[in-house]
């Protein structure tokens, strides 16, 4: 058993049929010694008396809010949550496996630049009685500070018969050094509580591996005289690290016909303009990637040819 | 050229070669996710690689003030990786074909280090840890770790030379 926060405790249980469970001793936070009784949740049934209460925690029915009273007055509470371990593996019932980039990916994170700011998100089908708390650091043995905000519900989607809820959190490294080569990964830890079930999820990454620039901005076409060619130009996204002579991007320019089956013409360039042939009903798209490190491409910025 | 006396390197040449190094490093080990190398548990193997750290003066401001500290750090790293890529880690099994980008990577690391430090000038270099894994799986794991780490190192070096070529070239 360990303390998650004040008056909230997590009991770690090996979860299998007829498991013996864990013996837990609760102590009433009071100077009083006599006349103390214990109850669980809203029930008025007295579970025991005395300053301490010993219970055998085996299942969710044994978890909940234990309260000690004296003469009708509440003295203190202890909330017990359960953390299940099945076949040596901690349960992951609350969050959905996003399976990208690999199986058992519950948390996904992205950064728009090298400033040390990043966003993580996760998915669940649970809509109520759900709380999250997020902590992060750079490195684990001698951790350096990363400050995370509160997790918020950022999207709701219908998937077949189910509703899916996306939560996200923003974090910022306290003393980021955008130009340095990272040697210690960022660690992100999410505590999830659903009713009386506790689970924790972690992710470990370098900012360089989660970089995904915003799409190029101000995408414009300039027709070239007496030609089917156009000059496409664009700018670095505002959110990208500066100076651009140091934090450089590379770009992919694509000409795509109306039909998805039509052949795509692609050009790669380090410049912020390119000359392409504009076909009727086609569109021109541009996306960006770090020039020197192959992290994710941005989403496409697009304009129609006509 | 970045000689200890403090004259400038051939920024544009260094820029071109460092960008080529980036491309080669990703050709040699393109996969980001097929093995989470940090989960593999033998941390000591690549902990000794030289990293370009915050105080090394490789940020735009540090380069403007005095690029020598940064260039020395880059040179140190290039020599370190060049030695690793020429070692038994990359010559033993699993077999690399003669067309492997590792061969070109090895030659380009040497080329860039020579651009930074012509014959007759000496910056101190970092000791290479004596790693001689006997099993193919240990060797392959080390290769992947070294190449992932090299990708990060050459990315910073390429940024330095790109910025230098754009802002510090005479």
């Amino acid at each position: 058993i360990w303390e998650l926060k004040k008056d909230v405790y997590v009991v770690e249980l090996d979860w299998y049929p007829d498991a013996p469970g864990e013996m837990v001793v609760l102590t009433c936070d009071t100077p009083e010694e006599d006349g103390i009784t214990w109850t669980l949740d809203q029930s008025s049934e007295v579970l025991g008396s005395g300053k301490t209460l010993t219970i055998q925690v085996k299942e969710f029915g044994d978890a909940g809010q234990y309260t000690c009273h004296k003469g009708g007055e509440v003295l203190s509470h202890s909330l017990l949550l359960l953390h299940k371990k099945e076949d040596g593996i901690w349960s992951t019932d609350i969050l959905k496996d996003q399976k990208e980039p690999k199986n058992k990916t519950f948390l996904r994170c992205e950064a728009k630049n090298y400033s040390g700011r990043f966003t993580c998100w996760w998915l669940t089908t649970i809509s109520t009685d759900l709380t999250f708390s997020v902590k992060s650091s750079r490195g684990s043995s001698d951790p350096q500070g990363v400050t995370c905000g509160a997790a918020t519900l950022s999207a709701e989607r219908v998937r077949g018969d189910n509703k899916e809820y996306e939560y996200s959190v923003e974090c910022q490294e306290d003393s980021a050094c955008p130009a340095a080569e990272e040697s210690l990964p960022i660690e992100v830890m999410v505590d999830a509580v659903h009713k009386l079930k506790y689970e924790n999820y972690t992710s470990s990454f370098f900012i360089r591996d989660i970089i995904k620039p915003d799409p190029p901005k101000n995408l414009q076409l300039k027709p070239l005289k007496n030609s089917r060619q156009v000059e496409v130009s664009w700018e670095y996204p505002d959110t990208w690290s500066t100076p651009h002579s140091y934090f450089s991007l590379t770009f992919c320019v694509q000409v795509q016909g109306k039909s998805k089956r039509e052949k795509k013409d692609r050009v790669f360039t380090d410049k912020t303009s390119a000359t392409v042939i504009c076909r009727k009903n086609a569109s021109i798209s541009v996306r960006a990637q770090d020039r020197y490190y192959s992290s994710s491409w941005s989403e496409w910025a697009s304009v129609p040819c006509s | 050229r970045a000689v200890p006396g403090g004259s400038s390197p051939a920024w544009t040449q260094c820029q071109q070669l460092s960008q080529k190094l980036c491309t080669l490093a990703w050709s040699a080990h393109p996969l980001v996710g097929h093995m989470d190398l940090r989960e593999e548990g033998d941390e000591e193997t690549t902990n000794d690689v030289p990293h370009i750290q915050c105080g090394d003066g490789c940020d735009p401001q540090g380069l403007r003030d005095n690029s020598q500290f940064c260039l020395q750090r880059i040179h140190q790293g290039l020599i370190f990786y060049e030695k690793l890529l020429g070692s038994d880690i990359f010559t033993g099994e699993p077999s690399l074909l003669p067309d492997s980008p590792v061969g070109q990577l090895h030659a380009s690391l040497l080329g860039l280090s020579q651009l930074l430090q012509p014959e007759g000038h000496h910056w101190e270099t970092q000791q290479i840890p004596s790693l001689s894994p006997s099993q193919p799986w240990q060797r392959l794991l080390l290769r992947f770790k070294i190449l992932r780490s090299l990708q990060a190192f050459v990315a910073v070096a390429a940024r330095v030379f790109a910025h230098g070529a754009a802002t510090l070239s005479p």
Epitope: - | S27, H34, M35, L97, D99, Q135, W137
Partner: antibody, heavy 120, light 107 residues
């Protein structure tokens, strides 16, 4: 896109020789090794060897040394595999293939195969 | 030479079944193993490399696992178009060698 086009089927007498060609296109011929494999009827694959056109250096499976000669013609982007002193057990489909760009020998692109039949 | 012992040599399964093919290397090959599919009269097609990485365009029902000497190719839900021969291949050590193949049929 990368393509490997092999020469047509051959029927040969025991003791004779055969030269199979593999014309490459869609990439820089001198950049990558070209490998040869064979597959006897109803059998698995056997790796014969490769040529690196950049420096014309071949490498052979010891089991095929003296039996096989692999060459390359940079001017036509074509690799050749010559089999000598043919015997009935050399009857097989012969494939050329090129590996992944990372320098390890898993094979992404294959020729369509050339059936060599050795029969008296 | 490294022997790649592949089993079973043939198997028959129903559509939707989970199918497993194994390959045992005679010595450590790290994860330098690829798997190929060869349909009758066709050229071998790369499915998996580095023991577990799916090649571009290969359906997610195909997965690979293993390291050092023991390797597995799994088809999570067999489809009619999966009827073919399957070969493992080690590229750790010269001469590169292949398993003898598994002929997969639909019941």
């Amino acid at each position: 896109q990368v393509q490997l086009v092999q020469s047509g089927a051959e029927v040969k007498k025991p003791g004779s020789s055969v030269k199979v060609s593999c014309k490459a296109s869609g990439y820089t011929f001198t950049d990558q090794t070209i490998h040869w494999m064979r597959q006897a009827p109803g059998q698995g694959l056997e790796w014969i060897g490769y040529i690196y056109p950049r420096d014309d250096s071949p490498r052979y499976n010891e089991n095929f040394k003296g039996k096989v000669t692999i060459t390359a013609d940079k001017s036509t982007s074509t690799a050749y595999m010559e089999l000598s002193s043919l015997r009935s057990e050399d009857t097989a489909v012969y494939y050329c293939a090129i590996p992944d760009r990372s320098g390890y020998a898993w094979f992404i692109y294959w020729g369509q195969g050339t059936l060599v039949t050795v029969s008296s | 030479d490294i022997q790649m012992t592949q089993s079973p040599s043939s198997l028959s399964a129903s559509v939707g079944d989970r199918v497993t093919i194994t390959c045992k290397a005679s010595r450590d090959v790290a994860i330098a193993v690829a798997w190929y599919q060869q349909k009758p009269g066709k050229v071998p097609k790369l499915l998996i490399y580095w023991a577990s990485t799916r090649h571009t365009g290969v359906p997610s029902r195909f997965s690979g696992s293993g390291s050092r000497t023991d390797f597995t190719l799994t088809i999570s839900s067999l489809q009619p178009e999966d009827v073919a021969d399957y070969f493992c291949h080690q590229y750790s050590s010269y001469p590169f060698t292949f398993g003898s193949g598994t002929k997969l049929e639909i019941k």
